[in-house]
């Protein structure tokens, strides 16, 4: 039967390598050996990829294409094939559509004054376009209490937050996760950090 | 960091064939392609030729009868070679790697070859 | 092919002089034109792409205008290590050529 697509590639970039699309099917579909999403910087001599895509679920494909040096005016052309069948065409400007690299080894260390210092990684390098971009959404969560959670917002340039003890129930077991976005970019959320967990104590 | 580096014979007979190889790291040589520009002493740039990401290469037709560049992508080297090399074939051998479209971002050192008997 | 023209061969100019050199192609070349700036020791480094997007740690002094067939590299203020020899570049088709380079020194 005719292979379609029912809802179109949707694409995100981290704006450093990788550029993921993903769709969906209208039946259930093996993604790597019916699909190809080939893949072309809109610039003379620019050369033409082709990215196997992978399935999300039983009707989504995901395809993640390495972009390399991603620069603010490059535009993508998109062409997702079923064998010799055009199914979509369209471009993809990475910055345009940013989604950061999640934030990395979140952890917390106890500071003076019955404060608690909780730490984590920029993910991009200095020299990357993201890096003094990034501002910070810090969700603090009682294990034991789905009630009891807070939510910090980080707009200031480290990737440090310093939280009261007496602001969490004493002798409660908390979990902390932290993603990032980049305001000038307009981006979406980066995923979620895995959280770390803490025993917090004050007296 | 992203690196280029000729490797050439320096000195070669007339008649005889050029071989250059260009050794990358930094990169892919499945996903960028490279060129081969020349500069004869005290002259412009000029343009060789230049292998695709897949493979597929393009020549200028001034030198494709005598032209072949070929590469290893899991030894991350590029070839030229050369036939029938005369005097006015001595210059200064660069490889580069493209950039947007036919932009060359980054260019070894160069290899100097003299052709000469 | 594409002729590339640079018909100023050589440039004298002051530091903290602002410096244009021009380059001409034979044909329109749809903005598809690129400059690189080559040392007396041979080292060969992109400056500008696609007529004015300026390269990733290139000074921002450097800028890149034109159309059509005209264009031009401006230095805004001269600095001691821009002293080289500057080269156009058509990237519209292949072959690709450059022009016969600029060379820039100090009065």
């Known amino acids: 039967g005719s292979v379609k697509v029912l809802h179109e590639p949707s694409c995100f970039s981290d704006y450093i390598s990788t550029s993921v699309c993903q769709w969906k099917m209208d039946h259930p579909t093996n993604c790597s050996a019916e699909l190809r999403l080939s893949y072309q910087l809109d610039f003379m001599g620019s050369e033409n990829h082709t990215c196997v895509p992978e399935n999300r679920e039983d009707s989504v494909c995901v395809c993640s294409m390495p972009i390399d040096d991603a620069v603010e005016a490059d535009v993508y052309q998109l062409d997702l094939w079923a064998g010799q069948q055009l199914l979509w065409s369209g471009s993809f400007q990475p910055s345009k559509h940013v989604k950061p690299r999640t934030p990395g080894n979140l952890t917390v260390h106890p500071n003076i004054s019955h404060t608690w210092l909780l730490m984590w990684t920029n993910p991009y390098p200095t020299e990357n376009h993201l890096h003094s971009e990034l501002t910070y959404m810090v969700n603090v969560s009682n294990d034991n209490d789905p009630e009891d959670f807070k939510v910090y917002n980080v707009t200031y340039m480290g990737p440090t937050l310093r939280l009261a003890a007496s602001t969490l129930k004493s002798g409660a077991s908390y979990s902390a996760r932290v993603r990032a976005w980049a305001q000038t970019y307009n981006s979406t959320w980066s995923d979620w950090s895995p959280s770390t967990t803490w025993l917090n104590y004050y007296e | 960091q992203v690196q280029l580096k000729e490797s050439g014979p320096g000195l070669v007979a007339p008649s005889q064939s050029l071989s250059i190889t260009c050794t990358v790291s930094?990169?892919?040589?499945?996903?960028?392609?490279v060129h081969w520009v020349r500069q004869p002493p005290g002259k412009g740039l000029e343009w060789l030729g230049m292998?695709?990401?897949?493979?597929?290469?393009d020549y200028n037709s001034v030198f494709k009868s005598r032209l072949s560049i070929s590469k290893d992508n899991s030894k991350s080297q590029v070839f030229l070679k050369m036939n029938s090399l005369q005097t006015d074939d001595t210059a200064m051998y660069y490889c580069?790697?493209?950039?947007?479209?036919?932009?060359?971002?980054?260019w070894g050192q160069g290899t100097s070859v003299t052709v000469s008997s | 092919d594409i002729q590339m023209t640079q018909t100023t061969s050589s440039l004298s100019a002051s530091l903290g002089d602002r410096v244009t050199i021009s380059c001409r192609a034979s044909?329109?070349?749809?903005?598809?034109l690129n400059w690189y700036q080559q040392k007396p020791d041979g080292t060969v480094k992109l400056l500008i792409y696609y007529t004015s997007r300026l390269q990733s740690g290139v000074p921002s002094r450097f800028s890149g205008s034109g159309s059509g067939t005209d264009y031009c590299l401006t230095i805004s203020n001269l600095e001691q290590e821009d002293i080289a020899t500057y080269f156009c570049?058509?990237?519209?088709?292949?072959?690709?050529?450059f022009g016969s380079g600029t060379k820039l020194e100090l009065k």
């Open positions: 292998i695709w990401g897949g493979g597929s290469t």
């Open positions: 570049q058509q990237a519209n088709t292949l072959p690709l050529t």
């Open positions: 580069a790697r493209t950039y947007r479209g036919y932009a060359l971002d980054y």
């Open positions: 044909q329109d070349i749809s903005n598809y």
């Open positions: 930094g990169f892919s040589l499945s996903r960028y392609s």
